[in-house]
Structure formats: C-alpha cells, structure tokens
C-alpha cells in the first residue's frame, strides 16, 4: 500500500463568545485538513480526533466519525470544529481577550489531530501537531495558513 498523506492546513475560522459572570471564553475553532490517498483503491476516513491546548492545558476536544471515503489517487479537504473553553485557572485570559485597548488578541494554541483511515480491514493512524495563532477578541475568518505560529519553540503563553 502507498501512503495516505494528512496535511494540517490551518485555522479556517474562530468564533468567540463570553460568559461575563464566569469570566470564561468560548472559542469555536474550525480547522482544515487535506487528506490525500496515494493508493489505487479507495480508503475510508473512519474518524478524526482533535484536541486543542493552551499553555499546556487541554481546552477542547472533538471527534468526528464515519467522515468520508476518498477515491483512488484523490484528495479531500475536510473541515472540523473544536469547541474550546478558557476558564478557571486561566480566567486572566478573559481580562486580556476582552480588553478593547488591544487591537489584536492573539493567543497561541497547539492543535493536535489524529486521522484514522481504513482499507481492506486494515486501520492506520496519522497524527499532526501545529501551533496556531487565534484571536480571542473577535470572530475571525482566516486565509488558509494565515494563522500559523512559526516559532519552533514552545511559546510561553
């Protein structure tokens, strides 16, 4: 069998809402993946599991099941959304994200995704990790790749 390539493209959109009393931020982050099937037979994308980390803390998880079938030598672009919550010990972020004096409220999030594919009863998992900028102060739609955090080191925030 030839490879199944998974490429994390980036954040497509981030929609923000707030619980003012709880000083909590809700971010619905939609990500884009390209999955390429280099085989001469179809493969099934069985599930996608994703999680988002902020400052080494998991703030959101999502799982999509029975997603699609990718034909021979074909590629499909798949969007998936991870609902995230920044609260509790990170409530200082509410002060940052709702502070209007700051024009862009970029925070660095680590996006982790695992794609499980199956073909002829065989299962394969491919994982990706990327740091991405997301604006927690407003609803944002990104050009694909625009939100990439290029620093290879783990950021402080």
């Amino acid at each position: 069998p030839r490879s199944i390539d998974v490429k994390y493209i980036g954040v497509k959109s981030a929609y923000v809402s707030y619980d003012v009393q709880k000083r909590t931020i809700y971010l619905n982050i939609t990500n884009t993946l390209n999955i390429t099937n280099n085989n001469y037979y179809s493969v099934e994308v069985e599930n996608i599991t994703a999680q988002v980390q902020f400052s080494k803390t998991v703030i959101g998880k999502a799982r999509l099941n029975n997603i699609t079938i990718i034909g021979p030598l074909d590629m499909k672009q798949i969007d998936y959304t991870v609902p995230t919550v920044i609260a509790e010990e990170m409530s200082y972020m509410y002060d940052f994200c709702t502070l209007i004096s700051i024009k862009v409220h970029n925070i660095v999030l680590m996006m982790q995704v695992t794609v499980t594919t199956t073909y002829f009863g065989h299962s394969e998992q491919i994982s990706q990790e990327r740091y991405q900028y997301v604006d927690c102060g407003r609803n944002t739609t990104y050009q694909l790749g625009q939100s990439e955090y290029l620093n290879v080191l783990q950021p402080q925030q």
């Epitope: 509410y94 940052f96 209007i100």
Partner: antibody, heavy 117, light 112 residues
Framework: EVQLVESGGGLVKPGGSLKLSCAAS????????MSWVRETPEKRLEWVAF????????YYADNVKDRFTISRDNAKNNLYLQMRHLKSEDTAMYYC??????????WGQGTLVTVSV | DIVMTQAAFSNPVTLGTSASISCRSS???????????LFWYLQKPGQSPQLLIY???NLASGVPDRFSSSGSGTDFTLRISRVEAEDVGVYYC?????????FGGGTKLEIK
Amino acid sequence: EVQLVESGGGLVKPGGSLKLSCAASGFTFSNYAMSWVRETPEKRLEWVAFISDGGGYIYYADNVKDRFTISRDNAKNNLYLQMRHLKSEDTAMYYCARDGGTGFTYWGQGTLVTVSV
Amino acid sequence: DIVMTQAAFSNPVTLGTSASISCRSSKSLLHSNGITYLFWYLQKPGQSPQLLIYQMSNLASGVPDRFSSSGSGTDFTLRISRVEAEDVGVYYCVQNLELPYTFGGGTKLEIK
C-alpha cells in the same frame, strides 16, 4: 494577596521631572495590562497612560502625551511613569492600577505629586 | 472623547434604605462583542478607588450583593439595596470602550 505599591512622588518645580514606580506582587504581573490613573485636587479621576502585558501597546491621555513615558519591567514586576516638563495641572495623587477587560481590578495606595514653585 | 455625566450628589438616603446613582455616556458603550464597557468604582474617604461593577452589570470579587447595576448602551444606574455606613464615599462611572478611558465626575453618597 494582590498588592500594588507606588513610590517616587514628591514636590517638584514646574518644568521639572519625576519618575514614579509601582511594585506589583501577588499575581503574575506579565499576564496583565497596567494603567496609571490620577486624582486631581478637585477629586476628579483621570486616566493617564496604559501599557499592555508585553509592552506592545502604549497609550497616553492627550494632556500628557510627549511629556510622560510609561514602561514596565516584567522580570522585576515593576511599572514606571517617567514624567518630564511637569506643569501645575499635573499635581495629583497618582495610582497604578491593574487593567483589563474587567476594569481596574486593583489599585495601589497612590503617590502624591505636587508641582509648585 | 466619550463624556461621562454624573450628578455631583445623590439624594440623601437613610441607612437601611435603597439608593440609586445614575450615569450617562455621550456614546453607546455596547461593543460588537456583546459586552458593555461601563464600570463603577467607589472611593471611600482617604482610600484608593475600588472596583464595584465590571462590564455594566457584573459584581466584582468581594463586593456585597447589595450592589447591582443595570442600563442600556448610554444610561446606567447603580443601586444599593440596603445602604450601610461603610457605603459612604464617591461613586464613579467609567467607560473603557475607547481611549482615552473617561471617568464621570463622581457622585457623593449622602446619608441623612
């Protein structure tokens, strides 16, 4: 316990300079924006200057722009206000305050600046 | 600049009764993110100001629930349900929607 302690105030002649300091403790200073606010002898409160958590955003009230400079040292947990070309109307109690989307959540006890001949 | 307007003095109130303090802004303080950037502070005699209410209607940490606040985009009211002696001081409304942040002139709470 969150504490903000201002220092550096005093009596200065018009045209003179002063540097105010604010020592922060009890919270992660580098996570928060900070502001200086002053209380005039007439008991009016006036916002003076703002600095974001990392120092990337700095703003001033029009009446102090080009005369005052706000800065911070996150390693030392200190906020500063360098005041030059002081005028009599700058006479006030100067407070540092922790700033954010939820307002000035904590204030120092203030340091008095008197500009007079 | 956004102008914040307050009456200099409240109507004198008796301890244990309710009091209301009003504030008006020259522009709506409702942001597109759904938050109204109106704050209330109390400065007690000889003390620094303290935050009472953040984002129009939310009680700051440690503030008794005798205090409440409501309003529209431009007209705001702070209510104290049972006034106590320790509530005496000057109440300031502030807008943090736009720079420069602007304070109202302050309303002094008068006890009968």
